[in-house]
Interface confidence: low
Amino acid sequence: MMTGTIETTGNISAKKGGSVILQCHLSSTMAQVTQVNWEQHDHSLLAIRNAELGWHIYPAFKDRVAPGPGLGLTLQSLTMNDTGEYFCTYHTYPDGTYRGRIFLEVLESSVAEHSARFQIP
């Protein structure tokens, strides 16, 4: 039985050219996290964090994606094309797969603020 919940940074906004942290947190379960996948809105993989083997950032994003903090991901040099959905997929044992959603809006405006508030989707 899956008892856990994924908390995410929810809907966030950030300035074009700036950076943003995508963060998910799995709570309310004792399950072991074996792998976390980070996907972009078009289903392309940004990165994988394997518990035993470490981080892999996919080649297309190597210049603009940094691993961490923790199991999160830092997107740098943001462009307007980065606007959209991002998904964290937590592979856990024995529970199975948990999935969280974050919506990132990249703004031209200087008033954009990065919300660090966690939400349960």
Partner: antibody, heavy 121, light 110 residues
Framework: EVQLVESGGGLVQPGGSLRLSCAAS????????VPWVRKAPGKGLEWVGY????????YYADEVKGRFTISADDSKNSLYLQMNSLKTEDTAVYYC??????????????WGQGTLVTVSS | RIVMTQTPLSLSVTPGQPASISCQAS??????LAWYLDKPGQPPQLLIS???KLASGVPDRFSGSGSGTDFTLKISRVEAEDVGVYYC????????????FGGGTKVEIK
């Protein structure tokens, strides 16, 4: 054209060895998982093993563990399956197949035509 | 080790009629479930990935659904070219069990 071509199959006596090759063309071999799958006469598809393309470790089905070894040569865009201590139950058509999006789908979109391995005295 | 159980073992369908194949995983594998069609003398062909994503070039009479441990492949109107053995396949990322295939379902035309 994206394709996989297997070679090296043939007739071998029980206890003998055989080395299968899988040559890839039309895509960057090192960016994809390329598992070996076999189909024995009158039986279903059975996964044999693969090299994790991202992190490097090899994984094998219990039935072949300790007897089969998978290796890759990225410069030749080729994959190899070294089969030792062959048993009659290893008789099958052996396929290599491309995992089209490792970490996202784990689904095999390109298959070779297969090479027949017959283990018999 | 993960076990994939397919039902039924065989299916005889009248052309133009629907068909449905079920696949149950011994552990939660969502979303990593794929379906293949295996015809004699040919390598298997990917039909569906990620439980419901239609593979390139596959007719839209094929559809996949399900999550967690229970999955279904449906053919809305079976055609003669659809005969063969259908396999489900999963990947369980938590262990080294690799690509696990179901036992197969043979589809024939009445």
């Amino acid at each position: 054209e994206v394709q996989l071509v297997e070679s090296g199959g043939g007739l071998v006596q029980p206890g003998g060895s055989l080395r299968l090759s899988c040559a890839a063309s039309g895509f960057d071999f090192s960016s994809y998982g390329v598992p070996w799958v076999r189909k024995a006469p009158g039986k279903g598809l059975e996964w044999v093993g693969y090299i994790d393309p991202i992190f490097g470790p090899t994984y094998y089905a219990d039935e072949v563990k300790g007897r089969f070894t998978i290796s890759a040569d990225d410069s030749k865009n080729s994959l190899y399956l070294q089969m030792n201590s062959l048993k009659t139950e290893d008789t099958a058509v052996y396929y290599c197949a491309r995992d089209y999006s490792y970490g996202y789908a784990y689904a095999l979109d390109i298959w070779g035509q297969g090479t027949l391995v017959t283990v018999s005295s | 080790r993960i076990v994939m159980t397919q039902t039924p073992l065989s299916l005889s369908v009248t052309p133009g009629q629907p068909a449905s194949i079920s696949c149950q995983a011994s552990q939660r594998i969502s979303p990593y479930l794929a379906w293949y069609l295996d015809k004699p003398g040919q390598p298997p062909q990917l039909l569906i990935s990620r439980a419901s994503k239609l593979a390139s070039g596959v007719p839209d009479r094929f559809s996949g659904s399900g999550s967690g441990t229970d999955f279904t492949l449906k053919i809305s109107r079976v055609e003669a070219e659809d005969v063969g053995v259908y396999y489900c396949q999963s990947y369980y990322v938590h262990t080294s069990s690799g690509y696990a295939f179901g036992g197969g379902t043979k589809v024939e035309i009445k």
